[in-house]
Interface confidence: low
């Protein structure tokens, strides 16, 4: 071992450096001292450090470490925060479009229903938004409430418009009859399945992204232990006590110190990897009825079909309801259902193919690809931090925590450190409580993500086929399908171009007697070109 170089005879360099950390020189010896009170930078000879300086170095070292950790996670944190915000906003926009399409369908096809239909549609989509954001709302109840509310209005306005106001207490009976007589056929059940599956997946996707932010925030703001502070001080600052201002720590030594300091954080690695892979699996399955964009933007069409189903069976229904709700109705009123030949009994629900621009689906896949580049983020952290702090290349002529060495030897360094602190002991302490908590949250979300991962291939439930509904003609290579209607496929040019303004607000919503209903902008109308005889809301 080469002897330590003689310290600066006046401690001048140390004084000028330390003054940058702590204005005032009262703690810095003018000339080297024995340093018998030092606890971290244990001297092999005279030293330019005092106990107070050591404490300041420890504080600075821990702050440096926190800053390095924060800059290490900055890109990842920004990626998740930005995407969580983008997706949350995008989902709100999808909900708004879906509401507008549905309102437009009512306005154009069933104007007599509009004042109240707008209200029910508004309430339904409000609940959809709240559910996505985590509210404790039952999707089946939402759908039931929509159809329960719609049927009395359909019955009194379309099927039996002669009904006087005095007979309005028929509503309660009509709500009950709606379910008992399955007046909308299997459409409510179809919508329940599609909406609940797609919203569940959407909700957990957002939850997972928000947890990702929480994980990064937790590790970003970790307070490092005193032991770690001592190790960092020894690595970064103890060389100064010997007047070695330009010497860099050995790379191998830095890795050992960082692994010791980050032992708890690195424990997240296993669960973080699983989180990204589970999220990828979820995203890969978010298509057809598991894609809220497809499901919600196609709802207007399914609701339209459901009303046609009622109208088709209006004759039979009016008679049955007349008997069923006789106590609410003194006499039968003229029935105004449409001639049956106007309606096609569709056994197969056609599905619509969405033309890709920048869809939510492609945005999700892009996010997963970027996240996968951070899959080893936690296991690579010690190495990352060492590579972003000053270390000697090739471990030659570098500081090993005690002295300047020509070549770093981990074994020698460990032996030399034995009496000062125990790296192994530092690792054995286990993660901090906050890290343990975040690991538990990761375990929980990973479990949820796994249970939510969708089957590949045909995804529409068999139980929806009872009344001849089928999943339609979407091939496996087409991963954007909407439960639609009509005799041909609806071509829906995708609305969600992320960098576009996206402020489309048809706003035929919510109020009875809205005298200022805006019409869709021209570019929105062109969205529904070449529709043939399909029931587009904007025709």
């Amino acid at each position: 071992q080469p002897p330590p170089p003689p310290p600066d005879a006046t401690c001048h360099q140390v004084r000028s450096f330390f003054q940058r950390l702590q204005p005032g020189l009262k703690w810095v010896p003018e000339t080297p001292v024995p340093g018998s009170d030092l606890q971290v930078c244990l001297p092999k000879g005279p030293t330019c450090c005092s106990r107070k300086m050591e404490e300041k170095y420890q504080l600075t070292a821990r702050l440096n470490m926190e800053q390095l950790l924060q800059s290490a996670s900055m890109e990842l944190k920004f990626l998740i925060i930005q995407n969580a915000a983008v997706f949350q906003e995008a989902f709100e926009i999808v909900v708004r479009h879906a509401k507008n399409y549905t309102n437009a369908m009512f306005k154009n096809n069933y104007p007599s229903l509009t004042p109240q239909a707008f209200e029910f549609v508004g309430e339904f989509f409000t609940d959809v938004s709240l559910y996505i954001l985590g509210s404790d709302i039952n999707v089946d109840d939402m759908v039931n409430e929509l159809f329960d509310s719609l049927f009395p209005v359909i019955y009194t306005q379309l099927m039996n418009p002669g009904l006087p106001d005095s007979a309005l207490d028929i509503n309660e009976c009509l709500r009950g009859a709606r379910r008992d007589l399955k007046v909308f056929g299997n459409f409510p059940k179809l919508i329940m399945t599609q909406v609940s599956k797609s919203l569940q997946v959407t909700r957990i996707f957002l939850q997972a992204l928000n947890l990702g932010i929480e994980v990064i925030n937790t590790t970003d703001h970790l307070k490092f232990s005193k032991d770690c502070g001592r190790m960092l001080t020894r690595m970064w600052y103890c060389s100064y006590c010997q007047g070695l201002m330009m010497v860099k720590p050995c790379g191998g030594y830095c890795n050992v110190v960082m692994q010791g300091c980050m032992a708890g954080v690195v424990e997240i690695d296993k669960y973080w990897r699983e989180y990204i892979l589970s999220l990828e699996e979820l995203v890969n399955g978010m298509y057809r009825i598991y894609d809220m964009e497809n499901v919600l933007l196609g709802l207007f069409s399914t609701i339209h079909d459901s009303i046609q189903y009622v109208q088709k069976n209006a004759g039979k229904l009016t008679t049955t309801i007349g008997k069923l709700c006789a106590h609410s109705q003194q006499r039968q009123y003229r029935s105004a259902y449409y001639p049956e030949d106007l309606f096609i009994d569709k056994k197969v629900l056609k599905v619509a193919h969405v033309e890709h621009e920048e869809t939510l689906s492609s945005r999700r896949r892009e996010l997963i690809q970027k996240l996968k580049s951070f899959i080893s983020f936690y296991s690579a952290l010690p190495g990352y931090i060492c590579s972003h702090s000053p270390v000697a290349e090739n471990d030659t002529l570098c500081w090993n925590g005690q002295e300047l060495v020509e070549r770093y030897s981990q074994k020698a360094a460990r032996n030399g450190m034995k009496n000062q602190f125990n790296l192994h002991e530092l690792k054995m302490k286990g993660p901090e409580p906050v890290v343990s908590q975040i690991i538990d949250k990761l375990k929980h979300i990973n479990q949820l993500l796994r249970t939510m991962s969708m089957p590949k291939g045909r995804v529409l439930d068999k139980n929806l086929d009872e009344e001849g509904f089928e999943s339609g003609d979407c091939g496996d290579d087409e991963d954007e399908c909407i439960g639609g209607s009509g005799d041909g496929m609806i071509k829906v040019k995708n609305q969600l171009r992320f960098l576009a303004e996206l402020a489309y607000d048809l706003d035929v919503d919510d109020a009875p007697g809205n005298s200022q209903q805006a019409t869709p902008k021209d570019n929105e109308i062109s969205t529904f070109h070449n529709l043939g005889n399909v029931h587009s809301p904007l025709k």
């Epitope: 709100e92 409430e145 509310s149 607000d505 109020a511």
Partner: antibody
Framework: EVQLVESGGGLVKPGGSLKLSCAAS????????MSWVRQTPEKRLEWVAY????????YYPDSVKGRFTISRDNAKNTLYLQMSSLKSEDTAMYYC?????????????WGQGTLVTVS | DVVMTQTPLSLPVSLGDQASISCRSS???????????LHWYLQKPGQSPKLLIY???NRFSGVPDRFSGSGSGTDFTLKISRVEAEDLGVYFC?????????FGGGTKLEIK
């Protein structure tokens, strides 16, 4: 024509109870979310309670939570407000009003009001 | 709770004049869905309030087009282009973006 007619107001002692009713006609009551709004003697308006169209959801501001209960009987086209543990600051004209939904509602139609005096 | 502040408290006008009432909220009324739920009501003497304008600028059914609403975020205005005798009364602004719903203190429109 939409009509909302409140009743049940009157003079009551602090700590007492009162039940207000609102009879609706001229529209499909069952399909509307409903609210009670009160107007203080100083003419300030305060939202008091909300119930969704099917009656499944109710909401109250903190000032009345635990003391007031909103309910509806869709068969009778009637809205109710059960008020208990009344305080002098509950003195107001109470209006029933129809609205769309909690998150995006506005009070489209109002009754003529019923006066509650707590003294 | 969101505090709604109306100015002026009283607004004396001559018939045929333009009137303008201001309403300011203590926080933004832009809902996460992009809509702004700021509404205006008129209470004529001896009557219950009536809805005039919903969502900043939409006139309710039967409301004359001399009434218009504008504004965004936290600052909103109700304008009456030519005041008529039947417009006299107390005007209230109200928000339903945040629960609980809250109202402004009112602005009394009266004849000079």
């Amino acid at each position: 024509e939409v009509q909302l007619v409140e009743s049940g107001g009157g003079l009551v002692k602090p700590g007492g109870s009162l039940k207000l009713s609102c009879a609706a006609s001229g529209f499909a009551f069952i399909t509307y979310g409903m609210s009670w709004v009160r107007q203080t003697p100083e003419k300030r308006l305060e939202w008091v309670a909300y119930i969704s169209s099917g009656g499944a959801n109710t909401y109250y501001p903190d000032s009345v939570k635990g003391r007031f209960t909103i309910s509806r009987d869709n068969a009778k086209n009637t809205l109710y407000l059960q008020m208990s543990s009344l305080k002098s600051e509950d003195t107001a004209m109470y209006y029933c009003a129809s609205l769309s939904t909690l998150v995006r509602g506005w009070f489209a139609y109002w009754g003529q009001g019923t006066l509650v005096t707590v003294s | 709770d969101v505090v709604m502040t109306q100015t002026p408290l009283s607004l004396p006008v001559s018939l045929g004049d333009q009137a303008s009432i201001s309403c300011r909220s203590s926080q933004s009324l832009v809902h996460s869905n992009g809509n702004t739920y700021l509404h205006w009501y008129l209470q004529k003497p001896g009557q219950s309030p009536k809805l005039l304008i919903y969502k900043v600028s939409n006139r309710f059914s039967g409301v004359p087009d001399r009434f218009s609403g504008s504004g965004s975020g936290t600052d909103f205005t109700l304008k009456i282009s030519r005041v008529e005798a039947e417009d006299l009364g107390v005007y209230f602004c109200s928000q339903s973006t945040h629960v609980p719903y809250t109202f402004g203190g009112g602005t009394k429109l009266e004849i000079k």
